[in-house]
């Protein structure tokens, strides 16, 4: 089941999935002046069996000026540098994602890829948040969000992270005004069925990753 929305936006923070659940789709998008080749894949799909997961399909872009010829150019470092995405791009993977069954690692870039990636997440996906440069984190709980199914609808849990400017005087975590959950009531009051595939295993994994997830910043 695809998640209806993108993960929540936190001011001055970005998020990243450390691994992508089977069923996740990634748009095959091309940068300006390029387009997907006519016979090429529309999206990449994380698929697999009990022992191995990988991305099906390859994205290919061609110059908009030419018809259906792929220009095999290795992207220059500065070309890759410009990619921005809601999910943080990291040139090094801080954990061995193959150790998490039913998940794919970050797909490598393709020639003339768009500067942004749009993923279509599935129920059970977890993403991790970090404050952007120049802001520091005030944690009230886990800086992560999970796509859950409740009442037959998908929603993302609210990450317990506030990013404050280094120079700003702000409240300490204990002094925060409580934020309402998306439905306007605490999650614990929700009595209907909650589907959170792999939540436990990912939470445990997150605990071991906490110090290493964001050590490499994409400059």
């Amino acid at each position: 089941e695809l998640c209806d929305d993108d993960p929540p936006e936190i001011p001055h923070a970005t998020f990243k999935a450390m691994a992508y659940k089977e069923g996740t789709m990634l748009n095959c998008e091309c940068k300006r002046g390029f387009r997907r080749i006519k016979s090429g894949s529309l999206y990449m799909l994380c698929t697999g069996n009990s022992s191995h997961s990988s991305w099906d399909n390859q994205c290919q872009c061609t110059s908009s000026a030419t018809r259906n010829t792929t220009k095999q150019v290795t992207p220059q470092p500065e070309e890759q540098k410009e990619r921005k995405t809601t999910e943080m791009q990291s040139p090094m993977q801080p954990v061995d994602q193959a150790s998490l069954p039913g998940h794919c690692r970050e797909p490598p870039p393709w020639e003339n890829e768009a500067t942004e990636r749009i993923y279509h997440f599935v129920v059970g996906q977890m993403v991790y948040y970090q404050c952007v440069q120049g802001y520091r984190a005030l944690h009230r709980g886990p800086a992560e969000s999970v796509c859950k199914m409740t009442h037959g609808k998908t929603r993302w849990t609210q990450p317990q992270l506030i990013c404050t400017g280094e120079m700003e005087t702000s409240q300490f975590p204990g002094e925060e005004k409580p934020q309402a959950s998306p439905e306007g009531r605490p999650e614990s009051e929700t009595s209907c069925l909650v589907t959170t595939t792999d939540f436990q295993i990912q939470t445990e994994m997150a605990a071991t990753m906490e110090t290493s997830i964001f050590t490499t910043e994409y400059q």
Epitope: N27, C28, Y43, I118, Y119, H120
Partner: nanobody, 123 residues
């Protein structure tokens, strides 16, 4: 509540052009494709074109080269520029929004529909 409202339909002559618009509201459409379909009398609803948030496009063979889909994200609108129209293009044209990447979604599986706008091409 998601709403898709089409406009721009009408009666034109063979060879003329027409530009349809669709205003989408009620949610963020970042991870949705916006698409156009049409339904001629007595026929099934037919996929025409789709576009992603980042302007990745897909066209049905029947309209590629004649129709152009475009998207204005800040305004949450999608347009369909139709050139060199033919009498067989006569149909009700529907705007659609669907979760996921650009792909020719079968009509029964589409998440949201507009109410449609009539396009008639006379010879």
């Amino acid at each position: 509540q998601v709403q898709l409202v089409e406009s721009g339909g009408g009666l034109v002559q063979t060879g003329d052009s027409l530009r349809l618009s669709c205003a989408a509201s009620g949610r963020s459409f970042r991870n949705y494709i916006l698409a156009w379909y049409r339904q001629a009398p007595g026929k099934e609803r037919e996929f025409l074109a789709a576009i992603s948030w980042l302007d990745g496009t897909l066209y049905a063979d029947s309209v590629e080269g004649r129709f152009t889909i475009s998207r204005d994200n800040p305004k949450n609108t999608v347009h369909l520029q139709m050139d060199s129209l033919k009498p067989e293009d006569t149909a009700v044209y529907y705007c659609a929004a669907d979760r996921g990447p650009v792909r020719p979604v079968l009509a029964p599986d589409v998440d949201y529909w507009g109410q449609g706008t009539q396009v008639t091409v006379s010879s």
